[in-house]
Amino acid sequence: FERTRSLQDPCSNCPAGTFCDNNRNQICSPCPPNSFSSAGGQRTCDICRQCKGVFRTRKECSSTSNAECDCTPGFHCLGAGCSMCEQDCKQGQELTKKGCKDCCFGTFNDQKRGICRPWTNCSLDGKSVLVNGTKERDVVCGPSPADLSPGASSVTPPAPAREPGHSPQ
């Protein structure tokens, strides 16, 4: 089959990293600089993706594979193939149209990206709050009071000096 196909189409013999050059009697020519072909039998090489500005080269282009971009420090990739770079925020913050803003009381974000999420409601699972939540961390739920045998003590954190989730300004 391969022999038959190559007799019909000489371009099928051109490997990845080359193209079938119609201007040179369908000879297999190497891809020019800044271009690639990832499969054999190509009649053209594709231009490489260029990572510039806020986009940073994660993987260089080669004759057989495209470049890959990520984002410069302080940004992270969004979208297919890292088509956007979104600004990082600190833990305990979320990105709004006006920049990074602290999580509201009762919410937290333990990452540099994404939105603030509500603390877990321990009582929905019949449990009690073992460790209070902050802007950066969810609450830790402990066993429900009913689960505690007589005489057993639950870990009670000291009362916070300020509302949990609020940092001093």
Partner: antibody
């Protein structure tokens, strides 16, 4: 509020040079992730990218103009410049500067544009 | 260079019509495509970036779709202020390039 204001356009002799300015306000040219670009539009034609400069100072140019163009900036004045040499009739166009990115999301799109300045190359 | 070909070059439509403009790239550019609107004597205005993300402040009747080589800008219900010229732009590689434009005129 973000604003870009171009200046320096006018009538230029063929073979001459132009230096356009783009005064930016409402954001800093030296902020991480910020890029500013020059784009031109000949009368009745589409848009043509000339080149851009980033907060890091790195510049990128259109290969067709690279030998004649220089983009620079003055961070203290928050101003961008375009120098174009060996002018010819086909350089007649409205020249725009534009900010790249969009609020807290960065990329090679242009969210704020100046009003444009017309450059006419004629003897 | 990557060429962008828009179709149609111009179209006539009425207020309330659904309008679709296409942009075809000379090779795959993933989702690295933006759309702009330009009115006579004015600078272009960003509508859509990264193929489908609506720019802040742009009405939701505008939407973008596509990836690879074929992209679409759709105006779900044309308004009087939408009569303008629309351009696509790629940022896959330099030189950044624009389509030739599609002029949307009143029928």
């Amino acid at each position: 509020e973000v604003q870009l204001v171009e200046s320096g356009g006018g009538l230029v002799q063929p073979g001459g040079s132009l230096r356009l300015s783009c005064a930016a306000s409402g954001f800093s040219l030296s902020t991480s992730g910020v890029g500013v670009t020059w784009i031109r539009q000949a009368p009745g034609k589409s848009l043509e990218w000339i080149g851009d400069i980033y907060h890091s100072g790195s510049t990128y140019y259109s290969p067709s103009l690279k030998s004649r163009v220089t983009i620079s900036r003055d961070n203290s004045k928050n101003t961008l410049y375009l120098q174009l040499n060996s002018l010819r009739a086909e350089d007649t166009a409205v020249y725009y500067c534009a900010r790249e990115g969009s609020d807290a999301v960065a990329g090679d799109w242009f969210d704020y544009w100046g009003q444009g300045t017309l450059v006419t190359v004629s003897s | 260079d990557i060429q962008l070909t828009q179709s149609p070059s111009s179209l006539s439509a009425s207020v309330g019509d659904r309008v679709t403009i296409t942009c075809r790239a000379s090779q795959s550019i993933s989702s690295y495509l933006n759309w702009y609107q330009q009115k006579p004597g004015k600078a272009p205005k960003l509508l859509i970036y990264a193929a489908s993300t609506l720019q802040s402040g742009v009405p939701s009747r505008f939407s973008g779709s596509g990836s690879g080589t074929d992209f679409t800008l759709t105006i779900s219900s044309l308004q009087p202020e939408d009569f303008a010229t629309y351009y696509c732009q790629q940022y896959y590689s330099t030189p950044l390039t624009f389509g030739q434009g599609t002029k949307v005129e009143i029928k």
